[in-house]
């Protein structure tokens, strides 16, 4: 009795859905009552299918209402784990264990990314020095570098701080500040670049015509 996993690595976006597969041999009609399927994540029970039905009692609370094992797929010899609204905490190694006249298991890795798509920006000016302070902030995962450039695509040196956000999701809160002497209508870009995936997201900041006083809490989008 051998089970197969078409993929042993799934990389998905935070908040999306994922479908992980383990296939097992079925001759003619599947005897659901003889089938046992467990999906586990590092000793957390995700799905337990025994005697023709899912047993939700041992399911770990973090998967409640988000993890499913479609019965129509089981009938085809496919033990599919569907997780909806994927969280960062869902990342890790999953194990599908199947017993059907014998037993076997496979390990599958789930990686979760959260792109730094929504970039908040702020521009303020120090009246004493006429120096502008440009700020870009975004949440995502894993850690990103922030690259500042001017309209000539020259790289500028900003100061980036990374904190873990206080939200339940534990996304990384990345804030970068660039101090620069600039004049009205000068254009700057901040790019959140995730080193490992090579993915990046960019925001454009334009120095306004009128001087902007230093208002640390004033955020424009």
């Amino acid at each position: 009795f051998t089970i197969t996993a078409p993929k042993d690595l799934y990389v998905v976006e935070y908040g999306s859905n994922v479908t992980m597969e383990c296939r097992f041999p079925v001759e003619q009609k599947l005897d659901l009552l003889a089938l046992v399927v467990y999906w586990e994540k590092e000793d957390k029970e995700v799905i337990q299918f025994v005697e023709g039905e899912e047993d939700l009692k041992p399911q770990h609370s973090s998967f409640r209402g988000r993890a499913f094992l479609p019965k129509d797929q089981l009938l085809k010899g496919n033990a599919v784990l569907q997780i909806t609204d994927v969280k960062l905490q869902d990342a890790g190694v999953y194990c599908c264990m199947i017993s059907y006249g014998g037993a076997d298991y496979k390990r599958i890795t789930l990686k979760v990314n959260a792109p730094y798509r929504k970039i908040n920006q702020r521009i303020s000016m120090d009246p004493a020095t006429s120096e502008h302070e440009l700020m870009c902030q975004a949440e995502g995962y894993p850690e990103a570098e922030v690259i500042w450039t001017n309209s000539d695509h020259q790289s500028l040196s900003g100061e980036t701080t990374v904190t873990t956000s206080q939200t339940e999701e534990k996304l990384l809160n990345v804030t970068s500040v660039l101090r620069v002497n600039a004049t009205a209508n000068d254009v700057f870009h901040c790019t959140f670049w995730r080193v490992h995936s090579g993915e990046n997201h960019t925001a454009e900041l334009i120095i306004p015509e009128l001087p902007v006083p230093r208002l640390p809490h004033n955020r424009t989008h």
Epitope: V36, Y38, E51, S99, G102, Y105
Partner: antibody, heavy 120, light 107 residues
Framework: EVQLVQSGAEVKKPGATVKISCKVS????????MYWVRQATGQGLEWMGR????????KYNEKFKNRVTITADKSTSTAYMELSSLRSEDTAVYYC?????????????WGQGTTVTVSS | DVVMTQSPLSLPVTLGQPASISCKAS??????VAWYQQKPGQAPRLLIY???TRHTGVPSRFSGSGSGTEFTLTISSLQPDDFATYYC?????????FGQGTKVEIK
Amino acid sequence: EVQLVQSGAEVKKPGATVKISCKVSGYTFTSYWMYWVRQATGQGLEWMGRIDPNSGSTKYNEKFKNRVTITADKSTSTAYMELSSLRSEDTAVYYCARDYRKGLYAMDYWGQGTTVTVSS
Amino acid sequence: DVVMTQSPLSLPVTLGQPASISCKASQDVGTAVAWYQQKPGQAPRLLIYWASTRHTGVPSRFSGSGSGTEFTLTISSLQPDDFATYYCQQYNSYPLTFGQGTKVEIK
């Protein structure tokens, strides 16, 4: 504490039937499959069959198929193994054992064993 | 039936030394192999399942490896309590079958 307590030793004549009980405590009886394994004196282990106490579904080793019957009584959390048409080579220690995970076949808790002697 | 063949059947080992027991399956059993320890007059005790996963409470000196048809139980440094008979068992297909046992003895 998980415990599997088996009935006492039996001495039987060839052709007779023996029925051994295995009473469990310390866990939910219907949540784990129960196996029966035997071991002849100085010999290795031999799997006889299993039962799912919840559904009553059984699976037997073909070698014993027509002679062994495994049952379970949910009300008393007790599993039974009955072996008929006994012969001298059935002289062995018989163990009940729980699977560590329903349907995943490794046995994590065992009874103390019941010695069955078949002799004329 | 899947035949599980253990070797050696007797293994004399010095206290504190490592010991390795081999188990060969007559056909591919994936990683559905368990290892048990049995002492005279006692029931077997589960040590390893899924070929390499240590059961709860089993000391770290016990480790399992292998997949397919070849499996090994290793005891990194033999303690007085480890002298016993060891059995492998496959649960990849019915009937479940055991190896014939390896007796680890004091050298």
